[in-house]
Amino acid sequence: IWELKKDVYVVELDWYPDAPGEMVVLTCDTPEEDGITWTLDQSSEVLGSGKTLTIQVKEFGDAGQYTCHKGGEVLSHSLLLLHKKEDGIWSTDILKDQKEPKNKTFLRCEAKNYSGRFTCWWLTTISTDLTFSVKSSRGSSDPQGVTCGAATLSAERVRGDNKEYEYSVECQEDSACPAAEESLPIEVMVDAVHKLKYENYTSSFFIRDIIKPDPPKNLQLKPLKNSRQVEVSWEYPDTWSTPHSYFSLTFCVQVQGKSKREKKDRVFTDKTSATVICRKNASISVRAQDRYYSSSWSEWASVPCS
């Protein structure tokens, strides 16, 4: 058993039929010694008396908010949550496996630049009685500070018969050095509680590996005289790290016909312009990637050829 926060305790249980469970001793936070009784959740049934209560925790029915009282007055609360371990593996029932980039990916994170700011998100099909608390650091043995806000419900989607909820959180490294080579990874830890079930999820990454630039901005076409060719120009996204001479991007320019089956013409360039042939009903799209490190491409910015 360990303390998650003041008055909230996590009981770690091996989860199998007829498991013995864990013996837990609760102590009433009061100078009082006599006349103390204990109840669980909303029940008025007295579970025991005295300053301490000893319970055998085996299942969710044994978890919950234990309250000690004296003469009708509440003295203190202790909330017991359960963390299940089945066949040596901690349960992951609350969050959905996103399966990308690999199986057992519950947290996904992205950064728009090298400023030390990043966003993580996760999915669940659970709609209420949920708690998410996020902590982060750079490195784990001598951790350096990363500040995370409160998670927010960022999207709701219908997937077949199920509703899926996306939660996200923004974090910022306290003393980020954008140009420095990273030697220690960022660690992100999410404590998740559904009703009385506790689970924790972690992700470890270098900012360089989660970079995904915003799409190029101000995408424009300039027809070239007496030609089917056009000059496509664009700019670095506002959110990208500066100076651009150091934090450079490379770009992919694509000409795509109306039909997905039509051949795509692609040009790669380090410049912020390119000359391409604009076919009727086609569209021109440009995306960006860090020039010197193969992290994710941005989403496409697009304009019609006409």
Partner: nanobody, 124 residues
Framework: EVQLVESGGGLVQPGGSLRLSCAAS????????MSWVRQAPGKGLEWVSS????????YYAGSMKGRFTISRDNAKNTLYLQMSSLKPEDTAVYYC?????????????????WGQGTQVTVSS
């Protein structure tokens, strides 16, 4: 001393409206996600609504959506719950609660601070 003090409860007829307030003292509200949780007579606690630190995101339990509106005034260190189209089943003690993280839990201990509650009775 840290305190959350609810007010604005009372007796109202079905279909009527009430506005609950929750004044915080001893801490600044804008560091916290704020919630309303209620307890009907003889029932367990039920999460009602939550609002993000900056007020930009609001969340409601299904049966409260469209009838209740949560808001906050960080400058006044106060949380509000505007309740309209009230029904007898909305009769409960309404508590406000503060947490530094996202929660829609009904367990008091998961919140950092918790008020004493204000009684709302919907009856003709």
């Amino acid at each position: 001393e840290v305190q959350l003090v609810e007010s604005g409860g009372g007796l109202v007829q079905p279909g009527g409206s009430l506005r609950l307030s929750c004044a915080a003292s001893g801490f600044t509200l804008d560091d916290y996600t704020m919630s309303w949780v209620r307890q009907a007579p003889g029932k367990g606690l039920e999460w009602v609504s939550s609002i993000s630190r900056d007020g930009g995101r609001t969340y409601y339990a299904g049966s409260m959506k469209g009838r209740f509106t949560i808001s906050r005034d960080n400058a006044k260190n106060t949380l509000y719950l505007q309740m309209s189209s009230l029904k007898p089943e909305d009769t409960a003690v309404y508590y406000c609660a503060a947490a530094t993280f996202y929660t829609t839990s009904t367990y008091i201990s998961l919140y950092d601070y918790w008020g004493q509650g204000t009684q709302v009775t919907v009856s003709s």
